[in-house]
Interface confidence: low
């Protein structure tokens, strides 16, 4: 840019003119330096002096300017006869994250100095949270009433939600920023005409056992009176680690009769007190007709009559399944709702959220807990997350 000024009138960059000395003169010189993580590439020393032709000259390299190159501490590979070195990098993800890309994560430097992948061009991969791979999975040999202490952190997707009246319930982490819970949990101590906007600020949510996370919004299922489900969006993504990890959403329905799932929870224990420690229980999926008869007397709509042994009727429909008490009289209880019925797919070595506990009033009195089928709500979950 031609400033219209003589070059020797150095730009006013806030640098005071040095004082003159007798029988001497001031020589203008500059030193080139590089930003963090870059280093100077030059055969000179980076110091350039203004000559009488108003050119910046370095003693060793003349008017050839230095360059800043990435200082990654990576030595230059040796050259080979009749060959050349091709620069390539492989993207990898930190622990508990995996690469999401249609390519292989390897990028090569092209002639235009762009990093290019054969399959996806210059589109970079992303690191997404691993789901359903706890570092210390629950041991099926051990035997949330009764139940076992989750001493090893086997249920890193389990969150604890506390209402503004200090009632504890469950929620289930399904990705870095979203959790599933029940609509009933969200409405605890709220009137039926409360809105999602009213509800969000009244909830406190903990992940990783005791780490508080802030809620941005809640989204209720459009048919929440029949499908007892809501989603919670966090203000920030959580860092996934061995204590905090989402559970995977299933691509198939694991809720077949007899299949055993694990349900963890912060709900009431055998003394009917809220537990200070996360507990878990192993429960089998029950026959749906038996469950309906247990709670409603009949599977025939016109013959149904409220029969719940605990005085509260669960929602039972095509979006739900039941799980029975264990043979040890272990069961879910108040405060466990919102927790996942987690099934371990042994072939994939992955844990899937097959259901979300909706009816947690069984407490070893009624025979069945009732769960919302995750396969029934999966389209809505994915659509909601995409839109928000």
């Amino acid at each position: 840019v031609d400033s219209g000024n003589d070059v020797t009138d150095i730009a006013d960059d806030g640098c005071p003119k040095p004082p003159e000395i007798a029988h001497g003169y001031v020589e203008h010189s500059v030193r080139y330096q590089c930003k963090n993580y870059y280093k100077l590439r030059t055969e000179g020393d980076g110091v350039y002096t203004l000559n009488d032709k108003k050119q910046w000259i370095n003693k060793a390299v003349g008017d050839k300017l230095p360059e800043c190159e990435a200082d990654d501490g990576c030595p230059k590979p040796p050259e080979i006869a009749h060959g050349y070195v091709e620069h390539s990098v492989r993207y990898q993800c930190k622990n508990y994250y995996k690469l999401r890309t249609e390519g292989d994560g390897v990028y090569t430097l092209n002639n235009e100095k762009q990093w290019i992948n054969k399959a996806v061009g210059d589109k970079l991969p992303e690191c997404e949270a691993v789901c359903g791979k706890p570092k210390n999975p629950a041991n099926p040999v051990q035997r949330i009433l009764g139940g076992h202490l989750d001493a090893k952190g086997s249920f890193p997707w389990q969150a604890k939600m506390v209402s503004h009246h200090n009632l504890t319930t469950g929620a289930t982490l399904i990705n870095e920023q979203w959790l599933l819970t029940t609509a009933k949990n969200l409405f605890l101590n709220h009137s039926e005409n409360a809105t999602a906007k009213d509800i969000a600020p009244t909830l406190t949510l903990y992940v990783g056992k005791k780490q508080l996370v802030e809620i941005e919004k809640v989204v209720l299922h459009p048919n929440y009176s029949q499908v007892d489900i809501g989603l919670i969006k966090l203000k920030q993504k959580v860092s996934v680690n061995e204590r905090v990890m989402p559970i995977c959403l299933p691509s198939k329905d694991y809720a077949e009769v007899g299949r055993v799932g694990y349900v963890s929870g912060w709900g009431r224990n055998a003394n009917f007190k809220f537990t200070d420690h996360l507990k878990y229980v192993m429960l089998p999926v029950a026959d749906q007709d038996q469950c309906i008869r247990h709670y409603e007397g009949s599977t025939v709509p016109e013959k149904k009559t409220p029969k719940s042994p605990v005085g509260v009727q669960p929602i039972l429909n095509e979006h739900t399944f039941c799980a029975g008490m264990s043979k040890y009289q272990e069961d879910t209880c108040y405060g466990d709702a919102g927790s996942a019925f987690a099934v371990h797919d042994l072939e994939e070595d992955t844990w899937y959220a097959t259901g979300i506990l909706s009816f947690d009033k069984s407490c070893a009195v009624a025979e069945y807990g009732v769960y919302v089928k995750v396969t029934s709500i999966q389209d809505w979950v994915q659509k909601t997350i995409a839109e928000n």
Partner: antibody, heavy 121, light 108 residues
């Protein structure tokens, strides 16, 4: 560059009030929980108060509860600490701090240089 | 409230030494522990979070370990820049944030 700059410290008499400010820059202020921490002469670090990105979440140490109030103005990227009924034992360097990562309550990775409060008659 | 007890209060060591500072919590805090370094007249600097995770740009000679109630900070080979005061901090949200009383690491 992430930067926090405290101001508002000074000399105040016992029973007096001061309001500290912390100007934040270089990050999304309204998505981060913020805290005040102090260090009294010859003593260790002491947590004072924290406020979430969502201001429903406020926590204050028992030693200052009822006297100190934390607040924030997200439109001005500024954190405040209103200090009333000051005592000699409140004399300290006061730091504001930003949480490290995405958790609302986390270790603090960015600190201001501090502002000094002296309570003396 | 939770109490954090750091030891020793003062530690004399030489450049190149391996030093260990310990921190004990009065109740389990899982992995929610941080270590900070503070030099006179300066703000504290985060070294370790989640008990053992190294904060970015902190030299790898610093390491942390432990969970529950017992934690340690280790400096594998002391450098002149490492002489400072070190604090542990519990930041589990169920308690007030509690600091240890500090360990002054000085030149022998």
């Amino acid at each position: 560059e992430v930067h926090l700059l405290e101001s508002g410290g000074g000399l105040v008499q016992p029973g007096g009030s001061l309001r500290l400010s912390c100007q934040a820059s270089g990050f999304t202020f309204n998505s981060n929980a913020m805290s005040w921490v102090r260090r009294a002469p010859g003593k260790g670090l002491e947590w004072i108060s924290s406020i979430g990105a969502n201001t429903n979440y406020i926590y204050t140490a028992d030693s200052v509860k009822g006297r100190f109030t934390i607040s924030r103005d997200n439109s001005k990227n500024t954190l405040y600490l209103q200090m009333n009924s000051l005592r000699a034992e409140d004399t300290a360097a006061y730091y504001c701090a930003k949480n490290r990562d995405r958790y609302s309550y986390d270790a603090w990775s960015v600190w201001g240089q501090g502002t000094t409060v002296t309570v003396s008659s | 409230d939770i109490q954090m007890t750091q030891s020793p209060s003062t530690l004399s060591a030489s450049v190149g030494d391996r030093v260990t500072i310990t921190c004990r919590a009065s109740q389990s805090i899982d992995i929610w522990l941080a270590w900070y370094q503070q030099k006179p007249g300066k703000a504290p600097k985060l070294l370790i979070y989640e008990a053992s995770s190294l904060e970015s740009e902190v030299p790898s000679r610093f390491s942390g370990s432990g969970s529950g109630t017992e934690f340690t900070l280790t400096i594998s080979s002391l450098q002149p820049d490492d002489f400072a005061t070190y604090y542990c901090q519990a930041y589990n949200s169920n308690y007030p944030y509690a600091f240890g009383q500090g360990t002054n690491l000085e030149i022998k």
